[in-house]
């Protein structure tokens, strides 16, 4: 498994490496092979990151922030590889690294610019606040500041509230949208331009269903092909909103193909699941089953929310008994 980092070549012996927070990266450096190899990696021309000479590491004066986080490709040094393997990068590691390589033939200096990005998987939440309904796109930790765009029925929305809190290393961002009384579909996109990573949340409201007590209801939930990739790990959760909060009825994990059902009247069709159809049945309806049902299909790259409103009405029998 290669660490997530990619190199952008720029002139004058300078390269840009983009890494992801807490992951490992490689700072590249090569030289014309020769004997008597000396390698010194420095940060911002001041701090000692890693030193190698006379055939071994010399880390006595290594800056403490790099302790146990750096190593070279020792078997490849004689082939001209002076690259630095760098563990668990943080945003404080961003900056310019200089690799000095001396041999019996020559001395070369390479510069590597390290940029670090953060993109913890965002979420799209549906919330009721009093009589208002909100969609909230949020990302707990992101760096640099992302681009957030909303669309309603595939048309961009200009109004875009962003609640932002900054910590030492990253931003936490909420973008709420009031969708009270709307039957439109909504889409929120969060883009990290540095990591070239985009996440999309999509919300769809289905037509309301009217059912009689004791009947069963079938609620559809199928991913949109544009986003859905069956090879990618995802999770499907069905939940029901009661007094402003959702309780989970069932969930399915694609990685283990496990289904967990918390409501005995809930059923999933295994064959449909294999065809990426996560529609569900709820048997033996009662009046308290009225409400909003939410299907959430989520992966690292998307969240698809489908809302069904179910109205359960008393059956004629029940009504005549009363």
């Amino acid at each position: 498994i290669f660490p997530l980092a990619f190199f952008i070549y720029v002139p004058m012996n300078e390269q840009i490496v983009i890494g992801r927070l807490d992951e490992d990266i490689i700072l590249p450096s090569s030289f014309e092979r020769g004997s008597e190899v000396v390698i010194h990696w420095k940060y911002q021309d001041s701090y000692k990151v890693h030193s190698y000479y006379k055939g071994s590491d010399h880390l006595e004066s290594q800056d403490p922030r790099y302790a146990n986080r750096t190593s070279l490709f020792y078997n490849e040094i004689q082939n001209g590889n002076a690259s630095l393997f760098f563990r668990r990068v943080s945003l404080l590691d961003e900056g310019i690294y200089t690799c000095y390589v001396g041999t019996a033939i020559q001395v070369i200096t390479n510069k590597v610019v390290l940029k670090v990005g953060v993109f913890l998987t965002p979420v799209m939440k549906y919330e009721k606040r009093n009589t208002n309904s909100f969609l909230i796109c949020s990302v707990l930790s992101v760096y640099p500041r992302p681009i957030i765009t909303w669309k309603m029925d595939n048309t961009p929305i200009s109004e875009n509230n962003m609640e932002e809190t900054g910590s030492l290393d990253s931003f936490s961002i909420n973008s709420p949208l009031n969708i009270t009384g709307s039957n439109s579909s909504y889409e929120c996109t969060i883009e990290n331009s540095l990591l070239k990573q985009t996440w999309t949340g999509r919300w769809t409201m289905k037509d309301g269903l009217h059912k009689m007590q004791s009947e069963h209801v079938s609620l559809s939930c199928q991913p949109v092909n544009d986003y859905f990739s069956p090879n990618q790990d995802f999770k499907v959760t069905w939940s029901r909103m009661k007094s402003g909060t959702f309780s989970v009825l069932a969930y399915y994990l694609s990685s283990s193909q496990n289904t967990i059902i918390n409501e005995s009247r809930f059923s999933w069709n295994k064959e449909l699941i294999n065809q990426s159809d996560f529609s569900m049945n709820l048997m033996d309806l009662n009046l308290s089953d009225s409400g909003e049902y939410l299907c959430n299909i989520s992966s690292d790259e998307y969240t698809l929310l489908t809302i069904h409103t179910v109205h359960v009405e008393p059956s004629q029998e029940t009504a005549s008994h009363n």
Epitope: E36, V38, K42, Y53, K54, H58, Y100, G102, V107, T109
Partner: antibody, heavy 121, light 107 residues
Framework: QVQLVESGGGVVQPGRSLRLSCAAS????????IHWVRQAPGKGLEWVAV????????YYADSVRGRFTISRDNSKNTLSLQMNSLRVEDTAVYYC??????????????WGQGTLVTVSS | DIQMTQSPSTLSASVGDRVTITCRAS??????LAWYQQKPGKAPKLLIY???SLESGVPSRFSGSGSGTEFTLTISSLQPDDLATYYC?????????FGQGTKLEIK
């Protein structure tokens, strides 16, 4: 071609100070570590001090530690050795010598012609 | 400090002779050893580094061998120009130390 030229030697009394200089040319000075090595008249060679290419590391022989200070100015391609509290036994020809690379290797590829320091009352 | 002991202190040989100078370290220095030649009134000149690597521009009649604590400098066929004092130097650890020198005279 690589050239190292020492200067600043002379006769000085014990306890006094002297500053030696080494002017470098013919190579990228800021890429290389430089050492001072001395040789008492009719005696063998003795390593004195080293300064790394970027001046990040400086090391001294026990016999001079605390009295001598090595420094460099990469913008002027010059090396200096500030010698304080001089003793009679510091009398020697002082050579500046270029390391193989950063200063970390510790052997001397190019040498200057030397400058004589005589400590005598 | 690591002590370096050279033998012999003086050596007299004829042109064309094979000459060997020995250097012993007081503790192991792996192969971190250099040999220098110093002619009268001149600065030393690097001959060999890393015990056996010949410095660029040095005649191939010079060779070095050894590792650990025992090292030798060999001149395969002595030339008049080789009249000099030869020094070994360890660069395994600070402080770097030299042998006391071997003065080579031509018979």
């Amino acid at each position: 071609q690589v050239q190292l030229v020492e200067s600043g030697g002379g006769v000085v009394q014990p306890g006094r100070s002297l500053r030696l200089s080494c002017a470098a040319s013919g190579f990228t000075f800021s890429d290389y570590g430089i050492h001072w090595v001395r040789q008492a008249p009719g005696k063998g060679l003795e390593w004195v001090a080293v300064i790394w290419y970027d001046a990040s590391d400086k090391y001294y022989a026990d016999s001079v530690r605390g009295r001598f200070t090595i420094s460099r100015d990469n913008s002027k391609n010059t090396l200096s050795l500030q010698m304080n509290s001089l003793r009679v036994e510091d009398t020697a020809v002082y050579y500046c010598a270029r390391d193989r690379s950063s200063g970390a290797m510790g052997y001397f590829v190019y040498w200057g012609q030397g400058t004589l320091v005589t400590v005598s009352s | 400090d690591i002590q370096m002991t050279q033998s012999p202190s003086t050596l007299s040989a004829s042109v064309g002779d094979r000459v060997t100078i020995t250097c012993r370290a007081s503790q192991s220095i792996s192969s971190w050893l250099a040999w220098y030649q110093q002619k009268p009134g001149k600065a030393p000149k690097l001959l060999i580094y890393k015990a056996s690597s010949l410095e660029s521009g040095v005649p191939s009649r010079f060779s070095g061998s050894g590792s650990g604590t025992e090292f030798t400098l060999t001149i395969s066929s002595l030339q008049p120009d080789d009249l000099a004092t030869y020094y070994c130097q360890q660069y395994n650890a600070y402080s770097y130390t030299f042998g006391q020198g071997t003065k080579l005279e031509i018979k």
